[in-house]
């Protein structure tokens, strides 16, 4: 049960993890116009990985798209990269767990794929979220080192008459929302991975437990049983006691060593 | 077609307050911002504020301890006033819309003149 | 506050020729986000209040003849009126629409020579 519960929280918390990374890459608020400090402009600066917006006071907004991929820096150009490669990571760690989900059966799979899957998904998860959280960081990094040198620029230079406003850039929403974003989709994947270890089928042969039930001595050696498909009666994967009959997933639900993680 | 009449006092005394409504025709103030302007001899043209359609308003500093300005969206009416009057605040002023694009000032009204005298 | 300097500050002409007035900044109307100068030129006849020529510093508002051109960018900037109407004796003022507070050259007074 907890371990379902683990999986099923994992994808859930990943799958908002990296909803908000599509969000945060899309967004065109990466770095916004610093107004402390400044002259009050009659017009608001943002900028996106994509394009960059002015807002004026009137509330008309006008984008314009970076068209051109050679004149971009490099570090934009990584962001991108690291947000993409994040993206197209968690979608498909998505797909692969969806599959991997213990509450979903599919044919005859067994516990050992599934938690395969569920390894992979959080591996895929886990590098998803690094990357976000790269991504974002490398461009605050960059914002921090721009801001740096344009408020020296300010009072610097400025022997002459004529001054020019400078449009310093300070963190936009998006930064904060990859952020906690590639966090979550992190937490997801390492909540997967935990899942996994509950998952595995025990390959470790215990000794031979003795249960008693109405007075007979039944022997009873774990094994690597087959997961019940649900589909139709699987005598194989039962049991039989005087006292009833209990199939693995109730024998299962016994207190195991995975179920404290 | 757009308009704004303007109307308020011809003549108020110092150290009394001045009040102006400018109300809009052919527009919605819930679309777009009201700029008040004022035009002296001496001084020339002087910008004072604006009223954006969300309600919030910009003020000149130095003009923002004696000056309010707010708006009624359903009657289409924007309401200014300017406290501690002094004579060399003896001009005309003017509401003014403000246009969709360039920060500018598209449609004007008529005009308030405004003499400050004991 | 940015101060807005005009000259001339009165500028006789004749019908049909053309002319030229300068209006400069302090400081910089050129906004880095969009490449757009945040100037604006008026034209305000005697008893009448102030009519929306040009904004962006060169885009020609509706209804605006197209024999008035803005050009400039940064912090000087001028308006021409390649021949000169009866109608367009008037006082043109630049404003500045880029930093608060928002304010006005003395204006160019164009007369008849």
């Known amino acids: 049960m907890a371990v379902t519960a683990c999986q099923g929280l994992g994808f859930v918390v990943s799958l908002i993890g990296i909803a908000g990374i599509i969000a945060a890459t899309c967004m065109d608020q990466w770095s916004t116009q610093d107004l402390y400090n400044n002259p009050v402009t009659a017009v608001f600066n943002y900028q996106g990985l994509w394009r960059s917006c002015v807002r004026e006071s009137s509330g008309f907004t006008e984008c314009r798209g970076y068209f051109t991929l050679l004149g971009l820096p490099a570090m934009l150009q990584a962001v991108r990269a690291l947000m993409i490669v994040g993206i197209v990571l968690g979608a498909i760690g998505l797909l692969v767990s969806i599959f991997a989900l213990k509450c979903i059966r599919i044919g005859s799979m067994e516990d050992s794929a599934k938690a395969n899957m569920t390894l992979t998904s959080g591996i895929m998860f886990i590098v998803s979220g690094l990357c976000a959280i790269a991504g974002v960081s490398v461009f605050a990094n960059m914002l921090v080192t721009n801001f740096w040198m344009s408020t020296a620029n300010m009072y610097t230079g400025m022997g002459g008459m004529v001054q020019t406003v400078q449009t310093r850039y300070t963190f936009g929403a998006a930064l904060f929302v990859g952020w906690v974003a590639g966090g979550l989709t992190l937490i997801g994947g390492v909540m997967m991975c935990i899942a996994c270890r509950g998952l595995a089928p025990e390959e470790t042969n215990y000794k031979a437990v003795s249960y008693h039930a109405s007075g007979h001595s039944v022997a009873y050696k774990p094994g690597g049983f087959k997961a019940s498909t649900g589909f139709g009666s699987n005598t194989k994967n039962k049991k039989i006691y005087d006292g009833g009959a209990r199939t693995e997933d109730e024998v299962q639900s016994y207190p195991s060593k995975h179920d404290y993680v | 077609q757009v308009q704004l009449k303007q109307s308020g006092p011809g003549l108020v005394q110092p150290s009394q307050s001045l009040s102006i409504t400018c109300t809009v025709s052919?527009?919605?103030?819930?679309?777009?911002?009201v700029h008040w302007v004022r035009q002296s001899p001496g001084k020339g043209l002087e910008w004072l504020g604006v009223?954006?359609?969300?309600?919030?308003?910009d003020y000149n500093a130095a003009f923002i301890s004696r000056l309010n300005i707010r708006k009624d969206n359903s009657k289409s009416q924007v309401f200014f006033k300017m406290n501690s009057l002094k004579p060399n605040d003896t001009a005309i002023y003017y509401c003014?819309?403000?246009?969709?694009?360039?920060?500018?000032?598209?449609?004007w009204g008529q005009g308030t003149t405004l003499t400050v005298s004991s | 506050d940015i101060v807005m300097t005009q000259s001339p500050s009165s500028l006789p002409v004749t019908a049909g020729e053309k002319v030229t007035m300068s209006c400069k900044s302090s400081?910089?109307?050129?906004?880095?986000?969009?490449?757009?100068?945040?100037l604006t030129w008026y034209q305000q006849k005697p008893g009448q209040p102030p009519k929306l020529l040009i904004y962006?510093?060169?885009t020609r508002d509706s209804g605006v003849p197209d024999r008035f051109t803005g050009s400039g960018s940064g912090t000087d900037f001028t308006l021409t009126i390649s021949s000169v109407q009866a109608e367009d004796l008037a006082v043109y003022y630049c404003?500045?629409?880029?930093?608060?507070?928002?304010?006005f050259g003395a204006g160019t007074k164009l007369e008849l020579k």
């Open positions: 003014a819309r403000a246009a969709y694009f360039g920060n500018s000032f598209d449609y």
């Open positions: 052919g527009f919605s103030l819930t679309r777009y911002g």
């Open positions: 009223i954006w359609s969300g309600g919030n308003t």
């Open positions: 400081q910089s109307l050129l906004n880095s986000g969009n490449q757009k100068n945040y």
């Open positions: 962006w510093a060169s």
């Open positions: 404003q500045n629409n880029y930093i608060y507070p928002l304010t």
